[in-house]
């Protein structure tokens, strides 16, 4: 039996991530919500303890008992100026227990106090469980990452958290080291290399310079800003739109917590969109006092709002270079880590600073640290796989691709995570009699209904010869090439008439963040989606059958073959069902299926009798 895999855990300030190296490649493991990163949040309620997404999701309802930022406390003394400063901004209470900070919460009606190691251990337990659910067996061995600037006390406390979580901590490694491992920068065989890791996360900014020589990593310098990250960019957007709302509607929403929270969520989404598009729109219904807030922002405006923050990221870069006694020309590799490094302006500033040097950014920046930790865990467990040295990264379609069919249903031709290039073909037909054309609407996403997915493009295939519904055969082909460019072709098989659309991944496509959000939401809504999909499928099956039976018995070719009594019986029942359908579009699956079976009970014996007698 193959030995149990060791996992790599990126224990982050705001989010954590777990990966495993198996079958020759690293898998970043999604949690039960489908999210590849899990909030480093623990919440305590009157009835239960929540960890991860469940905890973060209820933070607004239970702020005093929802703990995050444990990484800012771990291994520090209560009197540490960092602790004293951060405490002012947290909604939960931090108390002093012999100069050790403890988080005090109300749990199941009692006051409880937890050490930061305990909180972090709860997050690590969650990451361990995520890995076990994926692997299907118990996991004990792990590599855990910490910032390069963590002192021994912080490292030891992190290791203790691992032990509390039931993990055998193989090693504590530096986050920038893990990122460098992820890119295989220790295996270039080109002698000593200087690597600058630029890590801009949700709440922290770290710059590290490593020297790598023959698999040996040496931290030459660290710099950064422990309170700079994506949240600060969100704040700039929020302030901008609060002012815009004031100008447009003469109302100040800044004191309304719910309105600000909804605006912040929309701003986060807009920020992500602006990493892949030059413009983003916000549509918030009834934001404040019944006023709908529909607005937009350009990438240029966003860059202007955050220009000082973006520029400020270069100061720690310069400081790190000074401390490492290196000139920028001596840096061989630049590695991007953290979701905020997807911001084009941040990338451009860094690239320009290094005179146009290429950036290592092919691995999802949210996952690079866990990726490297997983590789290190495999090495420490004695994995001799060549792929530990030579990792293969196959490109995949990040979201399902398909088209809209009757009832607004998303019919996927290319499933999410299909390796590309790929090509899929399916036959579709018309929905009504003598339909002259079909509208092909191409969507990406994981939801059951197209309204919840992203429209990529549409085109019309016209000139279909008049025919009853269900007769024409429209062949639709989805073809993605190695560059992720999608060609969709529709051909009427009777005439050979065709039309196509080409969708490239640069205009109007979802950013990686949005893709992840959609995948995450899809997991959350999966059960509801399945019910909805089955319901619409049952409805469509009933509708198709009713119309087919109606047209079958009305066919002139059946004159004299079917008795008037039987014809009336079928038509009456079809009429009953069609009218019922019109009035009951939101009926349950069971009801649609019952009606179909009732209709089949009437029609099948009559129709089969016709063909037996023929």
């Amino acid at each position: 039996m193959a030995k149990a895999a060791a996992i790599g855990i990126d224990l982050g300030t705001t989010y954590s991530c777990v990966g495993v190296f198996q079958h020759g490649k690293v898998e970043i493991i999604a949690n039960d919500q489908g999210n590849r990163t899990t909030p480093s949040y623990v919440a305590f309620t009157d009835t239960e303890r929540l960890i991860g997404d469940a905890a973060k999701n209820q933070v607004a309802l239970n702020p005093q008992n929802t703990v995050f930022d444990a990484k800012r406390l771990i291994g520090r003394k209560f009197g540490d100026p960092v602790v004293q400063s951060d405490m002012k901004h947290w909604p939960f209470q931090v108390i002093n227990d012999g100069d050790k900070p403890k988080v005090q919460v109300s749990y199941k009606g009692e006051t409880k106090a937890f050490y930061p190691e305990e909180i972090s251990s709860m997050v690590l337990t969650k990451m361990k469980e995520i890995a076990e659910a994926y692997l299907g067996y118990p996991v004990t061995n792990a590599v855990i990452t910490v910032p390069a600037y963590f002192n021994d006390s912080q490292r030891q406390a992190t290791k203790d958290a691992g032990v509390i979580a039931g993990l055998n901590v193989l090693r504590i490694i530096n986050e920038p080291t893990a990122a460098a491992i992820a890119y295989g920068l220790d295996r270039t065989g080109k002698g000593e290399r200087n690597v600058l890791i630029f890590d801009l996360g949700g709440g922290t900014f770290d710059v590290s310079i490593l020297t790598i020589d023959d698999g040996i990593f040496e931290v030459k310098a660290t710099a950064g800003d422990t309170h700079l990250g994506g949240e600060d960019f969100d704040n700039r957007l929020v302030n901008h739109f609060v002012e815009e709302f004031k100008r447009k509607h003469k109302k100040d929403i800044s004191q309304n917590k719910r309105a600000v929270r909804r605006l912040r969520t929309a701003c986060e989404r807009a920020k992500r969109t602006l990493s892949s598009s030059t413009q983003a729109s916000l549509e918030i219904d009834s934001l404040f006092e019944g006023i709908d807030f529909y607005t937009s922002i350009t990438r240029a405006r966003f860059e202007e709002l955050c220009s000082d923050l973006f520029r400020s990221t270069l100061e720690p870069v310069e400081k790190a270079l000074r401390d490492a006694k290196l000139d920028k020309a001596q840096i061989h590799d630049l590695v991007l880590v953290g979701g905020s490094t997807r911001i084009p302006k941040v990338q451009k500033l860094l690239q320009d600073f290094f005179n146009g040097r290429d950036l290592n950014k092919s691995i999802n920046p949210d996952e690079a640290v866990a990726y490297g930790a997983a590789v290190q865990a495999a090495i420490l467990m004695g994995d001799k796989s060549e792929n530990v040295q030579d990792l293969l990264l196959l490109d995949v379609a990040p979201l399902s691709l398909g088209l809209e069919t009757a009832g607004g249903v998303m019919t996927a031709l290319i499933k999410r995570n299909s390796t590309i290039p790929t090509k899929q073909t399916q036959i579709f037909t018309t929905y009504s009699d003598n339909q002259p054309g079909v509208l092909i609407q191409v969507y990406e996403g994981e939801r059951a209904m197209t309204k919840d997915n992203n429209l990529l493009g549409r085109f019309e295939l016209s000139g279909i010869p008049p025919a009853p519904r269900g007769v024409p055969q429209i062949e639709v082909t989805f073809d993605i090439d190695a560059n992720g460019i999608l060609n969709v072709t529709a051909t009427d098989k009777s005439t050979g008439k065709a039309n196509k659309i080409t969708i490239t991944n640069d205009k109007g496509r979802l950013s990686k963040e949005e893709i992840e959000r959609m995948v995450q939401e899809a997991e959350k809504y999966k059960a509801e989606d399945e019910v909805q999909r089955e319901r619409v499928s049952a409805k469509n099956a009933l509708e198709s059958y009713a119309f087919n039976m109606k047209s079958a018995v009305e066919d002139e070719g059946l004159k004299g073959k079917i008795s008037e009594a039987d014809k009336k019986k079928v038509l009456d029942k079809c009429q009953e069902v069609i009218s019922w359908l019109d009035a009951n579009t939101l009926a349950e699956k069971d009801e649609f299926e019952h009606k179909r079976k009732e209709l089949e009970q009437v029609c099948n014996p009559i129709i089969s009798g016709l063909y037996q007698g023929a």
């Epitope: 069609i578 019922w580 079976k597 014996p605």
Partner: antibody, heavy 116, light 112 residues
Amino acid sequence: QIQLVQSGPELKKPGETVKISCKASGYTFTNYGMNWVKQAPGKGLKWMGWINTYTGEPTYADDFKGRFAFSLETSATTAYLQINNLKNEDTATYFCARYDHAMDYWGQGTSVTVSS
Amino acid sequence: DIVMSQSPSSLAVSAGEKVTMSCKSSQSLLNSGTRKNYLAWYQQKPGQSPKLLIYWTSTRESGVPDRFTGSGSGTDFTLTINSVQAEDLAVYYCKQSYTLYTFGGGTKLEIK
């Protein structure tokens, strides 16, 4: 003439299985759905579901999903109701009923008693 | 699911009297295309199987005496027995077939 004749009374223990038959005659069996109705002692009628006699596809009412199974032996023009893992609350008379515009012909009923 | 409510739960009348009983549904049973209400009435005499009296609200099943009349539309329905006979002693059930099937709780008719 049209007739639905059901099997005789059954006395069963909790946890056992019972299978009731409903033999149809006097009409084309596969042209009409067969319904099953439960009547607990002193209680009203409760629709359990039905089976499409042409396709064999069953439909179960919400309260009868799980332990209950409808089946057919078309060649013998017979419908069956099987109840698995019998419980005390399954004690009742079970009727089969043919369906046209409504349940126009009924079997005489089969009494099932579940007692330890 | 559609819920069917019958009232009264029981009533006693003398032979020859006219009797009405009510059946209400939790949603309309009218199909606008066929203009039919999908409601049926059944009679169950003591110790016997139920028997179909009326379907589609007012259509009498063949062989059913014309003293039995069904009426109503939408959600409110009535079964009327014009001149009650001794053999009419039974429990009367309404049943909807608009979507799936549901029986009402029954009205017990006793003869004084």
